[in-house]
Amino acid sequence: PLATIPVSTTSLTSSEGSTISTPSVDISTPVTTSIVGDQCSRCKNGGFWDGLKCQCLTPYYGESCEEVVNSIDIAPPETVSAQMELTVTVTSVKFTDELKNHSSQEFREFNKTFTEQMNIVYSGIPEYVGVNITNLRLGSVVVEHDVLLRTKYTPEYKTALDNATEVVKQKITKVTTEQIMTNDNCSALMCFNTTGTQVQNITVTQYDPVEECRQKAEEYEDYFLVEYRDQKPYCISPCESGFNASKNCNHGKCQMSQNGARCLCVTTETHWYSGEDCNQGTQKSHHHHHH
């Protein structure tokens, strides 16, 4: 037996002016049939029948997955981060082979002192999370390490992280210039070789809500756009109300098609509505026909 899906019919007038009956199943889209056991359903656009109903893929919904949603959930990360690969040369500690072993007492003590020193250096940077030593080598001690930065996601996160990386560069340059050995002795927590300070690489979290929105919208990518509300991105079509890009269909219903958003104008007992935004009303004539 076939699973039947009720199809409701609405009397609407397209923006071109002609009255049309629109079934909720869009006959212009090829139908794929999904069969589970002896049930089958006309689940379209990649949707599948779960035994009870069509399970639709984004951006579709409806009994047959024939309609396009007005908004798509996009979830930016709570926080975004940057990782700076730096090298500094510590002159107040002499290199020994034990420093290469990350489980040695020597490495653990060096790591503790170095971390304390860097926490002091970067204490004024709100995005600063910590440092991670990746390698120690001879000369006195060349310290290859990562500086980790993190901030809450906002539309301007890249600027915030870029600014933080610049401050890191300024601060490490300053400390490695000021904290130097005098008479083969260090009066600071750590002393450095000024010329040994290098920024090797900077990696910033890449998150683009526009890209995520376009990917999820699939063939409707050109018609979905990102708008922000309270610093949060929303992936919307013009049919979603309450946004700057929202389409006002006045006396009609906004519907997405593969050509974009269009208004399907209503016909009431007294008026026909037409126009691109269904804002042109024509009063029906009240002639009575006598038989």
Partner: nanobody
Framework: DVQLVESGGGLVQPGGSLRLSCAAS????????MSWFRQAPGKEREGVAI???????GYADSVKGRFTISQDNAKNSLYLQMNSLRAEDTAMYYC?????????????????WGQGTQVTVSS
């Protein structure tokens, strides 16, 4: 757990001498560094002398030529020979140790400490 115990402090007249000792619980620091620090009442702790496993020694300017740091690895001991003592040398003297070959007389660079021994220079 590493333990450091100082001894040898006491009351001495100006111009006199004292020898401080520091016993480490094992020879862990024979490949690192050991040092002496002091702290006078109401003042910050300051570095006095360092000795490292590579034979390097360093002294604070105020004690150069008067104090000598030495080590006996066989006995896991550190010493500070103090000559020509002055009233301004009066302080609590602390032994500190590090697994690292350090060149730093900043107390924050040192992670292992003894309880201290009092040195008073007075007539």
């Amino acid at each position: 757990d590493v333990q450091l115990v100082e001894s040898g402090g006491g009351l001495v007249q100006p111009g006199g001498s004292l020898r401080l000792s520091c016993a480490a619980s094992d020879n862990t620091f024979s490949r690192g560094s050991m040092s002496w620090f002091r702290q006078a009442p109401g003042k910050e702790r300051e570095g006095v002398a360092i000795i490292s496993s590579d034979g390097w020694t360093g002294y604070a300017d105020s004690v150069k030529g008067r104090f000598t740091i030495s080590q006996d690895n066989a006995k896991n001991s550190l010493y500070l020979q103090m000559n020509s003592l002055r009233a301004e040398d009066t302080a609590m003297y602390y032994c500190a140790a590090s697994f690292l070959v350090l060149r730093a007389l900043n107390p924050k660079a040192w992670h292992y400490w003894g309880q201290g021994t009092q040195v008073t220079v007075s007539s």
